[in-house]
């Protein structure tokens, strides 16, 4: 665990004669605040994905009023650092977005107005515990200067904050094989002792005494390869005997979302859907008003001039959630046909088609009937870039592999009762009707509108459909 710290040094007009006017005026005094969003740097997530490493808002800066005729200077900044706590290991490579917001303090109806002045982004490599790293970035006509660092919270140390320190047991030196904990020289590095027997290749621990398995391995000591063939449940930990994943604690167990947030599992972890008035990875940020710029991804904030009155985020197309923090999962509509894999790239949807299929939505069957077997005596019928099977009696489905229920379509007319038979179906007709499907009424004088019934069958007896 640790804290990412961001220090804003200056925000002002960039160099050159085309410097912007001050964002504040005598008529509209204003003040600045900043928002930082952090993500693991090498994640494959879309640009608009949530701030998985955390986010923070600064305090408001001092009120500033433009001096008429004077060039826009660097604007007065909020005091202090922006701090983003992280619970797990520091990833080493991270992405950041820093936004500069203006709060206008004029006589707007409904309280102050907020607007985004500038946004900068980058991906950097940074070891925890290292010195402050500096950056200068331009955004439009503005220039932002800032420094950042990641530091571990005791007892964690190391470049990823995964090693632990503890006070020395002896005053002079650390135990055998243990180093002093720089910079805490009076402490010793604590050996991270995993559960006894935990596989050194396939297991690891972040807390002493635990044994967490790498993907593909399971069991209390991570010695059992995961076998997916005979397993029904999607997650672990596992049964050491079968190697199957059995239902175990999921990321949402115990609901990590605070303040009434609802938890949903994601492939990597979990995601909190926060009630209005709260946001953050675990809905832990509260007392939010529009002044805090809670609407992400260009959402428009309405209402909420004070912490007690809720705000509403009006989200742009493609985003949803009380803070516009979630991309609309366009893949949930399952647009890819024929088992294609859906990829939401942000700017577009892409379907990765299974072998034998093509087209933007995998709608074209390249095989047609070539090499396509229809089971159970069915015949393949070509047409329109796709194939279909014309199935023999008693079979159905795409490849005639499903045993059809011949009675499912209610083929017996006029209240006749249907019986499935190995070679098809049999209709037992209601009194007064006859025919293979009971489709013909029997005339009152006993004669039929049809030729006489076959020998051995009286009108009204079940007619076998051949």
């Amino acid at each position: 665990a640790g804290v990412f710290e961001l220090q804003i040094h200056s925000f002002g007009p960039g160099p050159g004669p085309g410097a912007p006017r001050s964002p504040c005026s005598a008529r509209l005094p204003c003040r600045l605040f900043f928002r930082v969003c952090l993500k693991p740097g090498l994640s494959e997530e879309a640009a608009e994905s949530p701030c998985a490493l955390g986010a923070a808002l600064s305090a408001r800066g001092p009120v500033y009023t433009e001096q008429p005729g004077a060039p826009a200077p660097d604007l007065p900044l909020p005091d202090g650092l922006l701090q983003v706590p992280f619970r797990d290991a520091w990833p080493g490579t991270f992405s950041f977005i820093i936004e500069t917001w203006r709060e206008e303090l004029g006589d707007q109806i409904g309280g102050p107005a907020w607007s985004l002045l500038a946004r900068v982004a980058g991906r950097r490599r940074l070891a925890a515990g290292g010195p402050w790293a500096r950056d200068i970035q331009r955004a439009g006509a503005w220039e932002l200067r800032f420094s950042y660092r990641a530091r571990c919270e005791p007892p964690a140390v190391g470049t990823a904050c995964t090693r632990l320190c503890r006070p020395r047991s002896a005053p002079s030196r650390c135990g055998p094989g243990l180093r002093p904990c720089a910079p805490l020289e009076d402490e010793c590095e604590a050996p991270l002792v995993c559960r006894a027997g935990c596989s050194p290749e396939h297991g690891f621990c972040e807390q002493p005494g635990e044994c967490r398995c790498l993907e593909g391995w399971t069991g209390p000591l991570c010695t059992v390869p995961v076998s997916t063939s005979s397993c029904l449940s999607p997650r672990g930990p596992s049964s050491a005997t079968t190697g199957c994943l059995v239902p175990g604690p999921g990321p949402c167990d115990g609901n990590p979302c605070a303040n009434g947030g609802s938890c949903s599992e994601t492939p990597r972890s979990f995601e909190c859907t926060c009630p209005r008035g709260f946001y953050g990875l675990r809905c832990e940020v509260s007392g939010v008003t529009c002044a805090d710029g809670p609407c992400f991804n260009g959402g428009l904030c309405v209402g909420g001039a004070d912490p007690d009155s809720a705000y509403i985020c009006h989200c742009p197309p493609g985003f949803q959630g009380s803070n516009c923090e979630k991309r609309v999962d366009r893949c949930s509509l399952q647009p890819c046909r024929n088992g294609g894999l859906c990829l939401d790239l942000g700017h577009a949807l892409r379907c990765r088609c299974r072998a034998g299929f093509a087209g933007p939505r995998c709608e074209h069957d390249l095989d047609d009937c070539a090499g396509r077997a229809c089971a159970n005596g069915g015949t393949c019928v070509e047409g329109g870039g796709a194939h279909r099977c014309s199935c023999a009696l008693g079979f159905g489905g795409r490849d005639c592999r499903e045993r059809a229920d011949p009675c499912a379509a209610r083929p017996c007319a006029h209240g006749g009762r249907c019986y499935a038979h190995f070679s098809g179906l049999v209709c037992a007709c209601a009194p007064g009707y006859m025919g293979a499907r009971c489709e013909f009424p029997v005339h009152p004088d006993g004669a039929s509108a049809l030729p006489a019934a076959p020998p051995g069958l009286r009108p009204g007896d079940p007619q076998r459909y051949l």
Partner: antibody, heavy 117, light 107 residues
């Protein structure tokens, strides 16, 4: 106005070192970083690294990490880039440029370095 | 490192034409893209930064657009002095990388 003036052309033998200077004027020297970018004949541009004149912090492209050194002299507002263990493929025009991490807004005129035996 | 692919690699056009050059990044770089103009024997000159911000002193016929992975430099009406080579550069990740260049020639 902002100006970056570089030292003159150099001819070096393989294995030797070259030191190119870049003198800044027209702005507060310590306010912006100085980057170095090179361009081999008929080729594209390749970023080598930068120095922050305030802190003397440097960051390099991994391709040059072990061979390049960047220094500065604040009294003359000059930055130096030294490239060692020269080989023929280091023949290029070397540019210094003022900027931050996402802009190089003023460039020197370039210094041609020829490596030939 | 992030790769930038510029297209076309060369282009012939006439004075007064509207010209578009594209730059595609190998991954999302948000809006961290700059465009530079370079004339033979000269240093590159910054035209556009952060995808669409025009550098001071650059004529307004130059404009930039795009974000994420796809970016465009447009010259609305070519002037004789615009015939040069144009490079895009990403500044999202370290090291900054340049596109291969587009040589704009007189037709």
């Amino acid at each position: 106005q902002v100006q970056l003036v570089q030292s003159g052309a150099e001819v070096k033998k393989p294995g030797a070192s070259v030191k190119v200077s870049c003198k800044a004027s027209g702005y507060t020297f310590t306010r912006y970083w100085i980057h170095w970018i090179r361009q081999a004949p008929g080729q594209g541009l390749e970023w080598m690294g930068y120095i922050n004149p305030t802190t003397v912090y440097t960051e390099f492209n991994q391709n040059f990490k072990d061979r390049v050194t960047m220094t500065r002299d604040t009294s003359t507002s000059t930055v130096y880039m030294e490239l060692s263990s020269l080989r023929s493929e280091d023949t290029a025009v070397y540019y210094c440029a003022r900027g931050g991490s996402n802009f190089f807004d003023h460039w020197g005129q370039g210094t041609t370095v020829t490596v030939s035996s | 490192a992030i790769q930038l692919t510029q297209s076309p690699s060369s282009l012939s056009a006439s004075v007064g034409d509207r010209v578009t050059i594209t730059c595609r990044a190998s991954e999302n770089i948000y809006y961290n893209l700059a465009w530079y103009q370079q004339k033979p024997g000269k240093a590159p000159k910054l035209l556009i930064y952060t995808a669409n911000s025009l550098e001071d002193g650059v004529p307004s016929r130059f404009s930039g657009s795009g974000s994420g992975t796809d970016f465009t430099l447009t010259i609305s009406s070519l002037q004789p002095e615009d015939f040069a080579t144009y490079f895009c550069k990403q500044a999202y990740d370290v090291p900054p990388t340049f596109g291969g260049g587009t040589k704009l020639e007189i037709k």
